[in-house]
Interface confidence: medium
């Protein structure tokens, strides 16, 4: 069943290359377990770039080694990119999946454009 | 280590009502739905319903609803079943069972009680 | 509600063969993802013990000889080769809708 899921259009990420959105469902049932997905999208591919499922009321957990963390309040998640490079520009989309109890709903946003930026390297001093 | 445990009888007068309970230890009780499971001497498994101790969310089959109320106490990590107005034919087991992540286990019950075993009787 | 058939209601089997037990949905339980449905063991006197999740999934500290198998309506349960302990009764489950349901059990003897 489809659900649907808000995120900004766009986001700046910051100097140190981390970069912030919240996505936010609509949620058409009392929904408990939830599992959300975080995708790229760059030149027609789509590639997943972390995951996580938690129960409401609790911390989103992302595997050790996840580029992502995040936060969720109510039917909204707080999601934190770290460690990007320019050439990580893209579209990320946010999917958002009611686990349980069932019935199983599903949704994907429209995707948030994050531009990064290459710091420019410091000059040397004289 | 995950447990669930249930007292192992209860005998009870027909027409009465009688609470049945679960402790949980070993785990974060407010994560994990419970179910809880009838099964009639020499007879197969009857899903009832299930709460979620994080919300009071229940579900019940529709068979069970005027039977059975669920509820929990997170102080004590305790579920309860309370069965009321007893029959002959709510003689039975009734197990708790904790229902593993969906996302990794897709509704399965990864761990149960000993069960209660419930006599009406006079 | 969704009906789960087990079949056979009871099976014999010889020691170090095969037991293949069915179950049967009333209809899907399947998704494009997964397959909604998991296999118990119990032994008189016990509480049921997950053996498959899934469909397919082995359970933590199950013996490899149980698999499962099987999609959309028509699942199935092997047990090979079979051992003195695996006499039990064996049940289905579904959950890709409440109310979850059992199938009503098969009994397996071992001779």
């Known amino acids: 069943k489809a659900m649907h899921v808000a995120q900004p259009a766009v986001v700046l990420a910051n100097s140190r290359g981390t970069a912030s959105f919240v996505c936010e469902y609509a949620s058409p049932g009392k929904a408990t377990e939830v599992r959300v997905t975080v995708l790229r999208q760059a030149d027609s591919q789509v590639t997943e770039v972390c995951a996580a499922t938690y129960m409401m009321g609790n911390e989103l957990t992302f595997l050790d080694d996840s580029i992502c963390t995040g936060t969720s309040s109510g039917n909204q998640v707080n999601l934190t990119i770290q460690g990007l490079r320019a050439m990580d520009t893209g579209l990320y989309i946010c999917k958002v999946e009611l686990m349980y109890p069932p019935p199983y709903y599903m949704g994907i946003g429209n995707g948030t454009q994050i531009y990064v930026i290459d710091p420019e390297p410091c000059p040397d001093s004289d | 280590q995950v447990q669930l445990q249930q007292p192992g009888s209860e005998l009870v007068r027909p027409g009465a009502s009688v609470k049945l309970s679960c402790k949980a230890s070993?785990?974060?009780?407010?994560?994990?739905?419970v179910h809880w499971v009838k099964q009639r001497p020499g007879q197969g498994l009857e899903w009832i319903g299930n709460?979620?101790?994080?919300?009071?969310?229940?579900n019940y089959d529709e068979k069970f609803i005027s039977k059975a109320t669920l509820t929990v106490d997170t102080s004590s990590s305790a579920a309860y079943m309370q069965l009321n107005s007893l029959t002959s034919e709510d003689s039975a087991v009734y197990y708790c069972?904790?229902?593993?992540?969906?996302?990794?286990?897709?509704?399965?019950?990864?761990?149960w009680g000993r069960g209660t075993s419930v006599t009406v009787s006079s | 509600d969704i009906v789960l058939t087990q079949s056979p209601a009871s099976l014999v089997v010889s020691l170090g063969q095969r037991a293949t037990i069915s179950c049967r949905a009333s209809?899907?339980?399947?998704?494009?993802?997964?397959?909604?449905m998991h296999w118990y063991q119990q032994k008189p006197g016990q509480p049921p013990k997950l053996l498959i999740y899934l469909a397919s999934n082995l359970e933590s500290g199950v013996p490899a000889r149980f698999s499962g198998s099987g999609s959309g309506t028509d699942f199935t349960l092997n047990v090979h080769p079979v051992e003195e302990e695996d006499a039990a009764t064996y049940y289905c489950q579904l959950s890709r809708e409440l109310p979850y349901t059992f199938g009503g059990g098969t009994k397996l003897e071992i001779k």
């Open positions: 070993g785990y974060t009780f407010t994560n994990y739905w």
């Open positions: 709460i979620f101790p994080g919300s009071d969310t229940s």
């Open positions: 069972a904790r229902l593993a992540y969906f996302t990794n286990y897709g509704g399965a019950m990864d761990y």
């Open positions: 209809k899907s339980v399947s998704t494009s993802a997964y397959n909604y």
